[in-house]
């Protein structure tokens, strides 16, 4: 569908099926008015997953999508969703008529705003192009983390961006590790933040017509060393039928590098515990947190022998944490089972007797078993 002086779908009626997916080529600078549903019950317009506001240069209002003057960054997919039901009434892709890369949905407006460019546009003060990426104003992060602030903007002429820290020009020269400025992404990145990085960071975006600014607040949380934290309720007691597959999940949170082991409590010579009172366990899986799937224990094609108590044991340089759950395996022919499995136990410390030897990573730990 090639558009001419004004792109307009009229009247504002429910679209026919063939209207639901369209591709519109729009000339730069051209006004756009698209309708979706009846005016009083018009749908909501979205671009890139964000609902369009009822005011502004690009607006969604009473079922109508209005763009005063089509710019390159307006290209992309627009959805009109029915109120309440979220049914897609319109699925439109707007394409810049003379852009070499018209299929992209977030073209850089810069190339179309340069004075040398063959097109001429009215001057425009800077404006935020992706305000949804700026919603998080306060960044409270642990020391050592990476922090990224963004202020994506556009305007004509193309605006420049500079950064302030606590009101002063900020170039990062006094910061260990410096800073990373990506002007094309309108971003400031600081790696391995420290408490002295705390403060108010301001992006100042300006061109000959005007300027806009936005403040971010950074708080750096000093790490308090602690043993791993395991998410409550995981692993969860599970009931499975013979032959089925089971996944036991263990979510581990740790500042220091954690190591995880999955253990199965076993019986040796008719006993679950050794003479010293420590339980017998078999190490099923061991790895560090960065290993694939370490937080999930997969049991394939389970049999009655797989029933029992399983423990997720996580340790770091500070200490150990563990949580346990019970797996109950039912025979295939028994479709109903109502008895409750024992509650998972959450305890602080643990020492395991093991038939195969715990990993070296735990050998330095002083672990005691407390029922």
């Amino acid at each position: 569908l090639e558009a001419s002086e004004e792109v307009e779908l009229e009247p504002c009626l429910a679209p026919s099926l063939e209207q639901q997916e369209q591709e519109l080529t729009v000339a730069l600078g051209q006004p756009v008015r698209l309708c979706c549903g009846r005016a009083e019950r018009g749908g909501h317009w979205y671009k890139e997953g964000s609902r369009l506001a009822p005011a502004g240069r690009v607006r969604g209002w009473r079922g109508r999508l209005e763009i005063a003057s089509f710019l390159p960054e307006d290209a992309g997919r627009y959805l009109c969703l029915a109120r309440g039901s979220m049914i897609v009434l319109q699925n439109l892709t707007l394409i810049t008529g003379d852009s070499l890369t018209s299929s992209n949905d977030d073209e850089d407006p810069k190339s179309h705003r340069d004075p040398s460019n063959r097109h001429s546009y009215p001057q425009q003060a800077p404006y935020w192009t992706h305000p949804q990426r700026m919603e998080k104003k306060l960044h409270a992060v642990p020391a050592g983390n990476t922090v990224k602030f963004r202020c994506p903007a556009a305007g004509n002429p193309t605006p420049t961006i500079r950064w302030l820290k606590d009101g002063q020009a900020f170039h990062g020269e006094n910061r260990i590790g410096g800073i990373r400025l990506r002007h094309q992404h309108w971003s400031l990145v600081m790696e391995s933040v420290v408490p002295s990085d705390r403060g108010t960071y301001t992006c100042l975006v300006e061109n000959a017509v005007g300027s806009i600014r936005y403040n971010y607040l950074l708080d750096v949380l000093e790490r308090s060393p602690h043993r791993p934290i395991l998410q409550a309720g995981l692993p969860a007691n599970t009931t499975a039928v013979v032959g089925s597959d089971v996944e036991l999940l263990c979510k581990v949170y740790s500042d220091a590098q954690p190591h995880i082991q999955w253990l199965k409590h076993i019986v040796i010579n008719g006993s679950s515990f050794g003479a010293d009172g420590f339980p017998y366990v078999q190490v099923l899986k061991t790895a560090d947190i960065n290993s694939s799937e370490v937080e999930v224990l997969y049991l394939r094609n389970v049999s009655a022998e797989d029933a029992g108590e399983y423990t997720c044991l996580a340790g770091n340089s500070i200490g150990l944490s563990y949580q346990s759950a019970w797996l109950t395996v039912l025979p295939e022919e028994d479709p109903t089972w109502t008895a409750a499995a024992p509650e998972a136990r959450y305890t602080d410390k643990l020492e395991f007797r093991h038939d195969s030897g715990l990993n070296d990573i735990f050998e330095a730990q002083k672990i005691e078993w407390h029922e």
């Epitope: 977030d106 073209e107 810069k110 992060v141 642990p142 990224k148 990373r180 990506r182 992404h185």
Partner: antibody, heavy 119, light 107 residues
């Protein structure tokens, strides 16, 4: 349409050098940041380096820092990767990729060029 | 550097199945996460950018969700052409690290 075509791969001895090129067409090259991404045989993807559209910003993976240099010639619509002090672990298919504007997603990729470092 | 951990590393599924792949970052990365599909001998293909945005031309059965540290790629109804390796990639930090990949195989 957007096209990226890598060249310059081949067999090189450990300690040797190689220069990869990526010829771009179908878009305004200087408007886009470009990256190199590599993939060792049978392994996953590893990001190598990025350069901003005007060349004002570059960054490298720790594994190649000090050995590889990314550059571009916007007048020739070409991206380069100069690889020095090559090691066996640099053996991989090297892809050049274009970054989406406002994001660092690689929306277009070349077909790749194989670099083999072996004695 | 920020580490990305994908799970599972491989999975077997049938055509029509709903498939979910997860990716966890070692720190908060906001929504700076992309998903790619790669078939043998081919370059990767961008599916989802910035956690939840469907790349132009990608079928709507692919969707992404999550923010912070935990992200999910969902294929609502697996098609024969979807059997491939899937990678997540963070672009929050200057070094754009990838996950180790998830191979989706035919059951």
């Amino acid at each position: 349409q957007v096209q990226l075509l890598e060249s310059g791969g081949g067999l090189v001895q450990p300690g040797g050098s190689l220069r990869l090129s990526c010829a771009a067409s179908g878009f305004t090259f200087s408007d886009y940041a470009m990256s190199w991404v590599r993939q060792a045989p049978g392994k996953g993807l590893e990001w190598v380096s990025v350069i901003e559209g005007d060349g004002s910003y570059t960054h490298y993976a720790d594994s190649v820092k000090g050995r590889f240099t990314i550059s571009r010639d916007n007048s020739k619509n070409t991206l380069y990767l100069q690889m020095n002090s090559l090691r066996a672990e640099d053996t991989a298919v090297y892809y050049c990729a274009r970054e989406k504007t406002y994001s660092s997603a690689f929306d277009y990729w070349g077909q790749g060029t194989l670099v083999t470092v072996s004695s | 550097d920020i580490q990305m951990t994908q799970s599972p590393s491989s999975l077997s599924a049938s055509v029509g199945d709903r498939v979910t792949i997860t990716c966890r970052a070692s720190q908060d990365i906001s929504s700076d996460l992309n998903w790619y599909q790669q078939k043998p001998g081919k370059a990767p293909k961008l599916l989802i950018y910035d956690a939840s945005n469907l790349q132009s031309g990608v079928p709507s059965r692919f969707s992404g969700s999550g923010s912070g540290t935990d992200f999910t790629l969902t294929i609502s109804s697996l098609q024969p052409e979807d059997f491939a390796v899937y990678y997540c990639q963070q672009h929050y930090s200057p070094s754009h690290t990838f996950g180790q990949g998830t191979k989706v195989e035919i059951k």
